[in-house]
């Protein structure tokens, strides 16, 4: 179930997955929630003696049991991911942090009259992930009222330092407040030749687009279908970027599908989850558990309720079926995507719905028997 | 469906085949189950054949070639074509069929949710069109139900592609810039469904297109969210009439 409480002066021991810098525990919790494997986190609000670089450290953790031993640590805040917290799920982070310099790669500097204006500049710049604003009281006159637009490979600051009269914050693209626009075009039989930031295995271009949307540096993508000539690239989703923020002209390529991230969309932002169940498909990955259930929908439900499950395969092979149902294999991987996709007539596969805002319901909202 | 793939049994349990039985029996259009006694389809399916008794409706079917004279079908009790539908125009291409007897819901035959009126501005990103129609412009009806995923196209953009037509707010367009995937002849009246917030919704009714799967020529669908009041009103008034005529 949903565990949203925070534990003060507590640090979880072990289970380390990744460490990043975040300005507060709430932001750390958000980062953990949207990380494919993170279930628990510990945040250091106060720097430990002699380890000043650990202040603002956000330590993302996992555990097979869903819990880790707690140790007392002054100034540490720990908690759980909100992966199963339905209505609390949001990547949007609107808080402003006074007296903090969130460092990263400064790619643009301009004069603005307010923090709000600076945040808007960041929200409306395709590359900007976070910003720092120097107020009119900043000690260096030449930087006063300057807005620094920043980015990093992780989408989070490379370090955070307390500095008087600096104010920092994040882009509000994830709050659906960007005015950049929303290019929803899908280009069939076209590939973008731009810089790859990452690649994942996906069953179709729509999942690829959603993965791109929630990747910090993906601006557009190219997906190679199951018919693609190079076997190792079949069902591979290449997440891409470019200096200009726009793709270079696409190349005609049979069995390739390309499109854009929807992270700048206002209305069409997808949820960070994939509802569709793919029949005739098997998702490979690290086996978490196997149960016997009746139908692929029930298998998806089981995966959704199993917090570590990222995706599943439901098998209808005679040897995989018993009186109580057929085999539902719950799986996971390092990046949340299958390690490989194969095509098997007797299989159905899909993803956990743990990051979906609204819980699945078979009830229709418009009732035709009501007036 | 052009550029689609075979569906599996029960994948689209709301899809029905509307067939006409004259000398021979032929699949004419698709339709969607929206209630135990109600099918939603396109008005143009009945142009020239507005006679309820020649139509047969098959639900829970994947392969049309498996239909025999023993296959159960539903008959039309009442055919309600939108009062503003005109054969000379493309607007108001929507019709309701009231069945003689209510359907039994099964894994393979159950209703699709209707959107709410508030969904007129919802942007859907996971949409599918299904049908037994042609797989190319000069093709033939398919035996196995076909499916294809298709992105929605904003109305303003769609209007630019169809300068000789009026794309009204009661229409919704879907297709790929490069073409290649689309509904086609025989898919009319069938569903354009989108999964939104974990729920499949009937977003469009296959209506028309310039050819099939042509470059820069999206498919045009009747936008169901714009007709919710009409659908509810017709179903309700049909119920009220039934009450008036039933024995005391």
């Amino acid at each position: 179930g949903c565990l949203s409480q925070l534990y003060a002066n507590t640090f979880f021991r072990g289970g380390d997955l990744a460490a990043i810098y975040t300005p507060d525990a709430q932001h750390c919790q958000k980062m953990c929630t949207f990380h494919p494997r993170c279930l628990l986190f510990s945040f250091l609000a106060v720097s430990p003696t002699k380890e000043t670089d650990k202040r603002f450290g956000c330590f993302m953790k996992e555990s097979i049991t869903g819990t880790l031993p707690r140790i007392h640590r002054t100034g540490a805040i720990s908690g759980h991911s909100l992966k199963q917290c339905g209505h609390q799920l949001s990547a949007c982070h609107q808080d402003i942090y006074e007296g903090l310099d969130m460092r990263g790669s400064n790619f643009n500097i301009s004069k603005t009259d307010s923090i709000e204006e600076c945040q808007k500049l960041c929200t409306n710049n395709i590359h900007c992930q976070f910003f720092t604003y120097a107020t009119k009281a900043f000690h260096r006159p030449e930087y006063r009222k300057s807005c620094l637009l920043k980015r990093s490979s992780s989408g989070t600051p490379t370090s955070i330092k307390p500095v008087d009269n600096l104010v920092s914050g994040f882009s509000l693209k994830s709050c659906a407040l960007s005015e950049i626009g929303c290019p929803m075009d899908i280009f069939q039989h076209f590939a973008f030749a731009d810089l790859n930031v990452s690649h994942v295995v996906t069953p179709d271009a729509f999942v690829c687009r959603t993965v791109c949307t929630f990747h910090p540096n993906c601006l557009f993508f190219t997906f190679y279908t199951n018919e693609w000539e190079t076997e190792s690239q079949r069902n591979v989703c290449f997440l891409k970027t470019s200096k200009s923020g726009r793709p270079s002209p696409p190349i005609i390529q049979e069995n390739a599908v390309s499109g854009y991230s929807l992270f700048t969309c206002r209305k069409a932002r997808p949820e960070p989850c994939h509802f569709k169940i793919y029949s005739g498909v098997a998702f490979e990955g690290e086996e978490l558990n196997a149960t016997f259930v009746q139908g692929a929908d029930a298998c998806q439900e089981t995966c959704t309720k199993t917090i570590r499950c990222q995706f599943f395969t439901y098998s209808l092979l005679p040897q995989d079926c018993k009186a109580e149902g057929c085999k539902c294999s719950l799986r996971l991987s390092t990046d949340g995507s299958p390690t490989r996709i194969t095509y098997e007539a007797q299989g159905s596969s899909g993803y956990s719905l743990r990051l979906c805002k609204v819980v699945e319901s078979s009830d229709c909202t418009t009732k035709i028997n009501a007036r | 469906i052009v550029g689609g793939t075979n569906s599996s049994l029960g994948e689209w349990p709301w899809q029905v085949s509307l067939q006409v039985k004259l000398v021979s029996q032929n699949h004419m259009c698709g339709g969607s189950i929206i209630g135990r006694q109600w099918i939603l389809t396109a008005a143009h399916c009945f142009d020239g054949i507005p006679y309820p008794d020649v139509w047969r409706i098959y639900g829970g079917i994947l392969n049309l070639s498996e239909i025999t004279n023993k296959t159960p079908f539903s008959s039309i009790k009442e055919l309600i074509i939108h009062q503003k539908y005109k054969m000379s125009e493309g607007s108001y291409d929507i019709a309701l069929i009231k069945l003689q007897t209510p359907l039994n819901y099964t894994e393979f035959q159950k209703p699709i949710c209707l959107p709410s009126k508030a969904d007129t501005n919802t942007i859907y990103t996971n949409c599918w069109v299904t049908g037994w129609g042609y797989t190319k412009e000069r093709g033939e009806t398919q035996n196995i139900l076909q499916k294809a995923t298709i992105p929605l196209v904003p109305n303003e953009e769609c209007q630019k592609k169809y300068r000789d037509y009026v794309i009204t707010k009661q229409m919704i367009c879907a297709g790929y810039k490069e073409g290649g995937i689309d509904a086609c002849k025989g898919d009319s009246g069938g569903p354009l469904v989108c999964k939104h917030s974990g729920r499949w919704q009937l977003v469009g009714i296959t209506s028309w297109g310039e050819g099939c799967a042509r470059k820069e020529q999206p498919g045009v669908y009747t936008k169901v969210a714009e007709y919710i009041d009409w659908i509810l009103e017709k179903i309700q008034s049909s119920k009220e009439r039934a009450l008036e005529t039933s024995p005391a």
Epitope: - | D47, E89, G90, D93, R163, D164, V166, S207, C212
Partner: antibody, heavy 125, light 108 residues
């Protein structure tokens, strides 16, 4: 009741100009594509031009391209044909017609369902 | 352009007889875009058949249309006195839209 009424025809010298009008009533004019068709004395029907419902798209027969301009005023429910550089071979009865565009088998249909009574244009010196 | 060739040029028949008019197109025409019109002297043309086979409103059922691709036919099952006129086929599948040269149905 749908009605189309042409006017503006008459005798004009070669090289001259004429503007035909077609007043429409009984239907939502702005929803329909409109067309002009002509018929030379004792000859068959010849399509001249059409205009999209909004007026933003026009197409012409090669024989009139560059000389004739089709336009419409949806607020006045009126279709126009501006004819310049007229030639003797443009002598004909000019009909305006409504283009019906229904739907059949998931495609559109196209046909001229209502015609005006025609207006005669004579080009002669 | 798509050329429509109608045959015969003239058809001489008596009332009560069956008339079969042919329209051949130089290229494939989607039957949805093939129409037939009737024209009597001094009158505007009148729509008879659209979509190759659908009768227009108010047209008697003795008129029927058939055909697809490049061969289309208009049939008048039993000629009535008012049916003697010129008949045109027309395509709007591709621009320029074109008419056939017409078939005159006259009283024998």
């Amino acid at each position: 009741e749908v009605q189309l009424l042409e006017s503006g025809g008459g005798l004009v010298q070669p090289g001259g100009s004429l503007r035909l009008s077609c007043a429409a009533s009984g239907f939502t004019f702005s929803h329909y594509l409109m067309t002009w068709v002509r018929q030379a004395p004792g000859k068959g029907l010849e399509w001249v031009s059409y205009i999209s419902p909004s007026g933003g798209h026009t197409i012409y027969a090669d024989s009139v391209k560059g000389r004739f301009t089709i336009s419409r005023d949806n607020s006045k429910n009126t279709l126009y044909l501006q004819m310049n550089s007229l030639r003797a071979e443009d002598t004909a009865v000019y009909y305006c017609a409504r283009v019906a565009r229904g739907i059949a088998a998931r495609s559109r249909t196209s046909y001229f369902d209502y015609w005006g009574q025609g207006t005669l244009v004579t080009v002669s010196s | 352009e798509i050329v429509l060739t109608q045959s015969p040029g003239t058809l001489s028949l008596s009332p009560g007889e069956r008339a079969t008019l042919s329209c051949r197109t130089s290229q494939f025409v989607n039957s949805n875009y093939l129409a037939w019109y009737q024209q009597k002297p001094g009158q505007a043309p009148r729509l008879l058949i659209y979509g190759a086979s659908s009768r227009a409103t108010g047209i008697p059922d003795r008129f029927s249309g058939s055909g697809s691709g490049t061969d289309f036919t208009l049939t008048i099952s039993r000629l009535e006195p008012e049916d003697f006129a010129v008949y045109y086929c027309q395509q709007s599948s591709r621009t320029p839209w074109t008419f056939g040269q017409g078939t005159k149905v006259e009283i024998k």
